[in-house]
Interface confidence: low
Amino acid sequence: AGVFELQIHSFGPGPGPGAPRSPCSARLPCRLFFRVCLKPGLSEEAAESPCALGAALSARGPVYTEQPGAPAPDLPLPDGLLQVPFRDAWPGTFSFIIETWREELGDQIGGPAWSLLARVAGRRRLAAGGPWARDIQRAGAWELRFSYRARCEPPAVGTACTRLCRPRSAPSRCGPGLRPCAPLEDECEAPLVCRAGCSPEHGFCEQPGECRCLEGWTGPLCTVPVSTSSCLSPRGPSSATTGCLVPGPGPCDGNPCANGGSCSETPRSFECTCPRGFYGLRCEVSGVTCADGPCFNGGLCVGGADPDSAYICHCPPGFQGSNCEKRVDRCSLQPCRNGGLCLDLGHALRCRCRAGFAGPRCEHDLDDCAGRACANGGTCVEGGGAHRCSCALGFGGRDCRERADPCAARPCAHGGRCYAHFSGLVCACAPGYMGARCEFPVHPDGASALPAAPPGLRPGDPQRYL
């Protein structure tokens, strides 16, 4: 057992354009109150399905009168926490709906009028006993900021409030096999007392007095092995004599969900997922209209003026689903470019950029050559987040620091011999050829194919390539 606690920090206009008008005025003063509805699990269930984990209503906030012409500020809030007690184990995963209601305090006939200002919904994982978790949710132009936590009521402890704690009998240590109860180090974990006779090998309990069976075992005390080989009937009574576990009628047998609702089994009962226009435990209630405010998260409701016509929710950016109840995973749109890691912080998207890239969406390719020197006269060439050096003749390697063998590529043509030289290479040409790489044949009459041989160079002399 324990308590889910919700603290509303602020309710007011969200950031960006289109600030909402204040819900109150000098002519019509009003005050706010909040309702929270909790459901176990992370199911995409209809907003109208029961608040199986519990619900709570806040006190009324201070009376507020808008100043004429002023933008809507954060509205004054009720004092205190919203507390939702839970009797059983805390499920760890839960869905919530938080509604902001306005109570108009004008001279209405028949007392104050209530209207729903905003509704936010979400699904979260939360361990009992942990610190306050903070959240920001938007509903249209409104923004709600709140904190929540689940805490166990003594003597329950643990992340699901299923372990029990007792004050320790001795100041130094707990009994055999029992641990101190963090964070209550002065207390000891109490042994759970299961149902009398519950098999210590095949049974266990999460609540005192129960006996739950490990897989493969059945019976009230978990002493009967399960054998499915001799099971013939798909449904029927279980047979303790044969050791055959034959499940009895299922909660969804005969589909208890009306009006086309689909049934799913839950640990304790069943749940109906209702089509649009119907709600209730068995989808038996019809006539959801836009007047009921079925669209979450600031969705715009269209149609459904009478109970026979369906409504459609037009969802704001970031939400989807027939009731705008599902938050879009904004990172699934892959907004971060060039392999950046996307992080949805709730208040903003952030991109963690790979080396070589920058910008809010990693869209800028950094100057890869900045601060990178290529040695020995090489020039830096950018490309794809890395840099490359185009080296001067006679040098190689990533940064042009390695001296290359200029003769490795056999640069001297027509059988010329190559000699490495401090400033490059020298070709000693075979008879009948000349030129820096011995590429030009010498004509038989002694005239070169070149317009003129450089002065002082005879054909066949070594040619230095500069």
Epitope: P73, D74, A133, F146, L343, A348, R350
Partner: antibody, heavy 124, light 111 residues
Framework: QVQLQQSGPGLVKPSQTLSLACAIS??????????WNWIRQSPSRGLEWLGG?????????DYAVSVKSRITINPDTSKNQLSLQLNSVTPEDTAVYYC??????????????WGQGTMVTVSS | QSVLTQPPSASGTPGQRVTISCSGS????????ANWYQQLPGTAPRLLIY???QRPSGVPDRFSGSKSGTSASLAISGLQSEDEADYYC???????????FGTGTKVTVLT
């Protein structure tokens, strides 16, 4: 209540590495709602946010563009502390350095808890 | 250096109302919430206002904040001698992908 206790040398030589630590009590460095930051203040530059680290099922860092190439902010979960390393310092890095916590009032960038500050002088 | 601009000084006599402005751009105050810090001489800054107009517990209600467009302002009504301090505005900047502070305003209480 939450407290941040800073430690580290007050004098660093140019081109060396500035290293500071921030011990956290009353909160956890791996809290999934807090953001742990380093901020500095000097007469010439005023208040300057240097960067932050935070845990959201894995660790993330945000660094200011002005120091991005020189800064490292590391959480130490075993000691429940935060460290700052600033490489290749120059006299321009002379300032009072603060660690701070953000995120708790529901605004990631509102810093509600501050360390006492450490005056660091960069001089040979 | 700072991308948020504040007047260097403001003053008033005890009991007076003093307002400090903070001018930014669409990438900071225009698209994010503004925060305000108070720094008393020789101490670390203290969060005074967050999310434009919210006061943390312990901050007197004579301090109030507001935001309009790309500017924010801090008002101190009923000025007291202990309010003599430096005041800084701040906001997240989407284009710099970082948190930016204002240039700071020194508030003097005249006696």
């Amino acid at each position: 209540q939450v407290q941040l206790q800073q430690s580290g040398p007050g004098l660093v030589k140019p081109s060396q590495t500035l290293s500071l630590a921030c011990a956290i009590s009353g909160d956890s460095v791996s809290s999934n709602s807090a953001i742990w930051n380093w901020i500095r203040q000097s007469p010439s530059r005023g208040l300057e946010w240097l960067g932050g680290t935070y845990y959201r099922s894995m660790w993330y860092n945000d660094y200011a563009v002005s120091v991005k190439s020189r800064i490292t902010i590391n959480p130490d979960t075993s000691k429940n502390q935060l460290s700052l390393q600033l490489n290749s310092v120059t006299p321009e890095d002379t300032a009072v350095y603060y660690c701070s916590r953000g995120g708790i009032v529901g605004v990631p960038d509102a810093f509600d808890i501050w360390g006492q500050g450490t005056m660091v002088t960069v001089s040979s | 250096q700072s991308v948020l601009t504040q007047p260097p000084s403001a003053s008033g006599t005890p009991g007076q109302r003093v307002t400090i402005s903070c001018s930014g751009s669409s990438s900071n105050i225009g698209s994010n919430t503004a925060n305000w810090y108070q720094q008393l001489p020789g101490t670390a800054p203290r969060l005074l206002i967050y999310r434009n107009n919210q006061r943390p517990s312990g901050v007197p209600d004579r301090f109030s904040g507001s935001k309009s467009g790309t500017s924010a302002s801090l008002a101190i009504s009923g000025l007291q001698s202990e309010d003599e301090a430096d005041y800084y505005c701040a906001a997240w900047d989407d284009s710099l992908n970082g948190y930016v502070f204002g240039t700071g305003t020194k508030v003097t209480v005249l006696t």
